[in-house]
């Protein structure tokens, strides 16, 4: 379970049409459900219910986004449509280049993601909790344009990869 270094770049637009970028760093863990590799994409926030096998959404997504999913307390969904691993697979099937789960309210999900699948996903599946999860959700809840970059080593410079 290696450390995942996540950088989130938030874009704030000004009335003149220019963008100011804010970079926030946080850490999570690569789960065994996915690959330990780098990924980058625009953040798409998703409720876990939205990762059920519902074919009504097939037209909604392109490839290359990073799914951010805040898991609920298990008692809110006693009979989930899919396991957490199944939901990660569903996101990747829909075009996610990586999935980040906030497991703060469902810590049992960590074991589910780390059980080790015979057929792990070829994309990273990261989980965050505690202060890092709060930081991530504060950004995501702003509903602004944001990109996430996931790395398996600490970034050398927070903004080196971002070319305006």
């Amino acid at each position: 379970k290696e450390t995942a270094f996540v950088e989130v770049v938030l874009f704030e637009s000004s009335p003149s049409g220019d963008y100011t970028t804010y970079t926030t760093g946080l850490t999570g863990r690569f789960s065994r459900a996915g690959a330990t590799l780098s990924a980058e994409g625009e953040i798409v926030q998703m409720h876990p219910l939205g990762l059920c096998n519902n074919n009504d959404e097939e037209d909604l997504y392109e490839y290359g986004w990073v799914g951010v999913v805040k898991l609920e307390q298990p008692e809110l969904d006693p009979k989930p449509c899919l396991t957490v691993l199944g939901k990660a697979k569903r996101a990747v099937q829909r075009g996610a280049t990586a999935v980040i789960f906030d497991v703060s309210e469902n810590p049992e999900a960590i074991d589910q993601l780390n059980q080790g699948s015979e057929d792990p996903l070829k994309r990273p599946v990261v989980y965050v909790k505690g202060a890092d999860a709060i930081k991530l959700m504060n950004i995501v809840n702003k509903q602004k344009v944001a990109r996430a970059r996931i790395q398996h080593r600490p970034p050398r410079q927070p903004t080196e990869y971002f070319d305006m």
Epitope: S13, E42, I43, V44, Q45, M46, H47, L49, G50, C52, N54, D56, E57, D59, L60, Y61, E62, W65, L76, D77, C81, Q143, K144, V145
Partner: antibody, heavy 119, light 107 residues
Framework: QVQLVQSGAEVKKPGASVKVSCKAS????????ISWVRQAPGQGLEWMGR????????KYAQKFQGRVTMTRDTSTSTVYMELSSLRSEDTAVYYC????????????WGQGTLVTVSS | DIQMTQSPSSLSASVGDRVTITCRAS??????LAWYQQKPGKAPKLLIY???TLQSGVPSRFSGSGSGTDFTLTISSLQPEDFATYYC?????????FGQGTKVEIK
């Protein structure tokens, strides 16, 4: 903050068409579906259909199939709803609304466009 | 199409009252249910989605519960700004459909 700004009120004659625009700003345009919902005077809410801004895929309510067309212009982050063969019962406020965390749960709404159909 | 039935269609209540509105779907919609508040001349405002998840920025006096076909919106202590019309809406399958609305008036 995400904002959806709609075009102004329209008065149309029966049989005509109307095209309402909805310009998105302050958030990701391409990643969340935009729906159109209408509300006749003193009545409830009625979903007309939705468009996926990235792919342009549409789903329309059967009631409006053949009369409604939803399109988008990614260069201006704008979606459009055109309703043809207008009749008096199409007089309503038309809203565009954007998904938030969950498909079909609309956290962001335009201010509404009143379309009046009258001879 | 899935029919959504709200009750009551209107109710009178006082500031500080606990208010409960129910919504029933004609078939199971799992937890694909949202609640909206609408004031005259304004666009609806999302309060709850996924049956029980509070939308960011919505006061915690609003809560939702239910799964399958029966759902409830509760306002634990009614405030002056809560007098409005409330709608439930399913997004389990298209066409997405709304309840007919519940108007909460001042007693």
């Amino acid at each position: 903050q995400v904002q959806l700004v709609q075009s102004g009120a329209e008065v149309k004659k029966p049989g005509a068409s109307v095209k309402v625009s909805c310009k998105a700003s302050g958030g990701t345009f391409s990643s969340y579906a935009i729906s159109w919902v209408r509300q006749a005077p003193g009545q409830g809410l009625e979903w007309m259909g939705r468009i996926s801004p990235n792919r342009g895929g549409t789903k329309y309510a059967q009631k409006f199939q053949g009369r409604v067309t939803m399109t988008r212009d990614t260069s201006t982050s704008t979606v459009y709803m055109e309703l043809s063969s207008l009749r008096s019962e199409d007089t309503a406020v038309y809203y565009c609304a954007r998904d938030s965390w969950l498909r079909g749960a609309w956290g962001y709404w335009g201010q509404g466009t009143l379309v009046t159909v009258s001879s | 199409d899935i029919q959504m039935t709200q009750s009551p269609s209107s109710l009178s209540a006082s500031v500080g009252d606990r208010v409960t509105i129910t919504c029933r779907a004609s078939q199971s919609i799992s937890r694909w249910l949202a609640w909206y508040q609408q004031k005259p001349g304004k666009a609806p405002k999302l309060l709850i989605y996924a049956a029980s998840t509070l939308q960011s920025g919505v006061p915690s006096r609003f809560s939702g519960s239910g799964s399958g076909t029966d759902f409830t919106l509760t306002i634990s202590s009614l405030q002056p700004e809560d007098f409005a019309t409330y709608y439930c809406q399913q997004s389990f399958s298209t066409p997405y459909t709304f309840g007919q609305g519940t108007k909460v008036e001042i007693k």
